[in-house]
Interface confidence: medium
């Protein structure tokens, strides 16, 4: 049988007299209304069992009839209270009642846990005229079972506006264990405690939960559902799975991964983006991270000259984007750069180093000692300095732009002049007679033009003076140096 | 109560075969795995390895893959033990032991001594 | 494999006295069990889980330890502790049994 009935129910005639003790009986009823889309009932209805007492609402009808006997109350009669049965069987079961004939219209609506069902529902409702009374037969089929028809179910009737309810029918479908929560995986702490949490329900209950480590039961007694295992540390990746029994069978939840945190592995990858003359733009490919999320990064920089004291720069900076501007560097300079990353475990090692170099840079520094004088003989201006420290050329040095500013009477002329690199002297016509002449000097390489000397000032007076001292770059801390003849 | 009962002493030569049986009473048998451990004269113990009385899947420890076998009859609750080719150094104490959560042996055989002499 | 070292190999205490044995691990465990064995006699399961006692131990006994130290204390020595106590690892497999501590009573 398809309905497993958990109390004994004999096949008790199922109504008085001449209606059918059962639909396999040759009587055609006069109506079979189906209940919505037609769906075809599957199997037997649950004997019902007249006689026993009844707990749902009764309807006690005013009516009488000619004989002015009164009639029964109207009440649902008994049918199975519980049916037992797998996931994917098909049920039918239904409600039975007698009632007068002198009720018209009556309907029966199928009710489960409090939820009148509408719609396509397999229900079928059938009438058996009689002289006096109708046996009204609602029948409710389901053709394969699922754990959301778990339920209640009850029958409704209105006749004059009181409401005729049958006893419950409990629907219990069985199967095989239905997780409603499994492990997850996770990535741990080496040696340190962490929970997993695997809970399954039946019916049929108990649900018995077994652990599985790495294909090895942890426990090899059961704990009920929901179990939660405190697993002590682990020291390598594992893989956890539940294994979930009931009578029906066993269910095995998905296997989930736990991963112990690690220190990441080196970058690899890094690259040079871009070169100037002091920074370098690199870019790297991360290692993989541990099992946790890296947090920052530390570039390592060190002089590749042999002759170089070999201290390391570092400098840090965040995960993302694996992207760093290497700022303060010399020009025209070798350098070696390794990367190295961290996460909550700590720091991987470092990246193969690479090599990178700066290109050639304006000089940083200005020429020293910069001094005018004034050759009248010649009509010239001498300027004479010395180069700056080879360090700070940033480059090789291809020449040197003098700047010369013209200034007598509310007039001012600046002209520039670019000399070669070799020597460091150099001679300008004088331009303008009583006037100031104000002369600074830059250094130059095929990186550009460094910054200019401090002005030096000299004056220039109308012709038939003689004996002219230079004009020189003052000490530090001195003001602008103004030769006064 | 639980008990585990071994069967008796044995005296092989060396190149023989012994069989040694662990009969289990007083819980569910297929609840719980076996492990094997044993003592060889004036040393500690050492695990041989389990096998799983629900699948009947053996695990052994790397000293012991080849001429240890693990066997089971559910029917009779019994989980066996088997030393092919037996060695001189085999000579020790054999213990079975019920494997509870964590591998703990909760319950132990008394316990069966291999002498292997010739 | 993870090695299991017991030390002392031996202990001797008078009765009264209070001794400690310990089990250091190659590598951590997560869980260390203790057994206690007398001659001509199986193995007991002693201490579980690190610190729990098993069923009929006397309560003078204690377990203790994480990662790779581990320790089982006697509060008070008794004549009847007189045994070889094992400690074994469950973390990873195999499972290993230290070389054992055995405890003389003066």
């Known amino acids: 049988a398809i309905t497993e009935a958990r109390e004994e129910a004999k096949p008790y005639p199922l109504f008085p007299g001449p209606f059918p003790g059962s639909l396999q009986t040759d009587h055609t009823p006069l109506l079979s209304l189906p209940h919505a889309s037609g769906y075809q009932p599957a199997l037997m209805f649950s004997p019902t069992q007249p006689g026993r007492p009844h707990t749902g609402n009764v309807a006690i009808p005013q009516v009488t009839s000619v004989e002015s006997k009164p009639l029964p109350p109207l009440a649902f009669k008994h049918t199975v209270g519980h049916i037992i049965l797998s996931e994917h069987k098909g049920v039918k079961f239904n409600c039975s009642i007698s009632v007068p004939n002198i009720y018209q219209d009556t309907t029966i609506s199928w009710w489960k846990d409090g939820k009148e069902l509408l719609g396509a529902h397999h229900a079928i409702t059938q009438f058996y005229p009689d002289d006096e009374v109708t046996a009204i037969i609602a029948s409710f089929s389901i053709t394969s079972v699922q754990r959301s028809d778990n339920g209640s179910y009850i029958c409704k009737m209105k006749i004059n506006n009181e409401e005729i309810v049958s006893d419950p029918i409990y629907i219990e479908v069985q199967g095989l264990p239905h997780f409603t929560k499994q492990p997850e995986s996770m990535n741990v702490t080496r040696n340190t405690a962490f929970n997993l949490t695997c809970q399954a329900v039946g019916p049929p209950e108990p649900v018995n939960i077994f652990w599985v480590q790495n294909s090895s039961r942890v426990n090899e007694q059961p704990e009920k559902s929901p179990s939660v295992l405190t697993v002590p540390g682990l020291t390598e990746m594992a893989v956890f799975s539940c294994e979930a029994h009931n009578d029906k069978g066993l269910t095995v939840s998905k296997g989930v991964q736990i991963n112990i945190k690690a220190i990441p592995s080196p970058p690899t990858e890094v690259s040079i983006r871009n070169s100037t003359a002091h920074s370098i733009l690199i870019s790297w490919v991360p290692g993989f991270d541990g099992y946790s999320p890296f947090r920052n990064c530390s570039i390592q920089v060190k002089e590749a000259d042999p002759l170089s004291n070999g201290s390391v720069m570092i400098f840090n900076t965040s995960a993302l984007p694996h992207l760093y501007q290497i700022k303060q560097l010399q020009a025209l300079a070798n350098y070696s750069i390794g990367v190295s990353c961290m996460n909550e475990i700590g720091w991987s090692a470092v990246s193969p180093w690479i090599l990178a170099s700066t290109t050639e840079g304006a000089p940083s520094v200005a020429p020293l000692n910069v001094t005018v004088f004034l050759n009248e003989s010649s009509d010239n201006v001498d300027i004479r300095w010395m180069k700056p420290p080879t360090k700070q050329q940033d480059g090789e040095l291809v020449g040197y732009r003098i700047s010369h500013v013209w200034q007598s009477a509310g007039i001012s002329k600046e002209l520039l002049e670019e000399v070669g690199q070799n020597g460091s002297r150099a001679r300008i016509s004088v331009q303008v007679h009583n006037a100031t002449c104000t002369v600074r000097i830059a250094a130059v390489t095929r990186g550009g033009v460094g910054p200019f000397s401090d002005p030096v000032k000299i004056f220039i007076p109308a012709h038939g003076w003689v004996d002219y001292a230079p004009s020189s770059t003052p000490a530090p801390g001195n003001a602008d140096p103004v030769l006064i003849i | 109560q639980i008990q585990l009962v071994q069967s008796g002493p044995e005296l092989k030569k060396p190149g023989e075969t012994v069989k040694i049986s662990c009969k289990a009473s007083?819980?569910?048998?297929?609840?719980?795995?076996m492990s094997w451990v044993h003592q060889a004269p004036g040393k500690g113990l050492k695990w041989l390895g389990w096998?799983?009385?629900?699948?009947?899947?053996?695990t052994y420890a790397d000293d012991f893959r080849g001429r240890f076998a693990f066997s089971l009859d559910t029917s009779v609750s019994t989980a066996s033990l088997e030393i092919n080719n037996l060695q001189n150094e085999d000579t020790a104490t054999y213990f079975c032991?019920?494997?509870?959560?964590?591998?703990?042996?909760?319950?132990w055989g008394q316990g069966t001594l291999v002498t292997v002499s010739t | 494999q993870i090695v299991l070292s017991q030390s002392p190999a031996i202990l001797s205490a008078s009765p009264g006295e209070k001794v400690t044995m310990t089990c250091r691990a190659t590598?951590?465990?997560?869980?260390m069990h203790w057994y206690q064995r007398k001659p001509g006699s199986s193995p007991k399961p002693w201490i579980y889980?690190?610190?729990n006692l098993a069923s009929g131990v006397p309560a003078r006994f204690s377990g203790s330890g994480s990662g790779t130290s581990y320790s089982l204390t006697i509060s008070r020595v008794e004549a009847e502790d007189a045994a070889t106590y094992y400690c074994?690892?469950?973390?990873?497999?195999?499972?290993?049994f230290g070389g054992g501590t055995k405890l003389e009573i003066k």
């Open positions: 032991a019920r494997e509870d959560n964590w591998a703990w042996f909760a319950y």
């Open positions: 007083g819980y569910t048998f297929t609840s719980y795995g």
């Open positions: 096998i799983n009385t629900y699948s009947g899947v053996p």
């Open positions: 590598s951590s465990v997560g869980y």
């Open positions: 889980a690190t610190s």
């Open positions: 074994q690892q469950w973390s990873s497999n195999p499972r290993t």
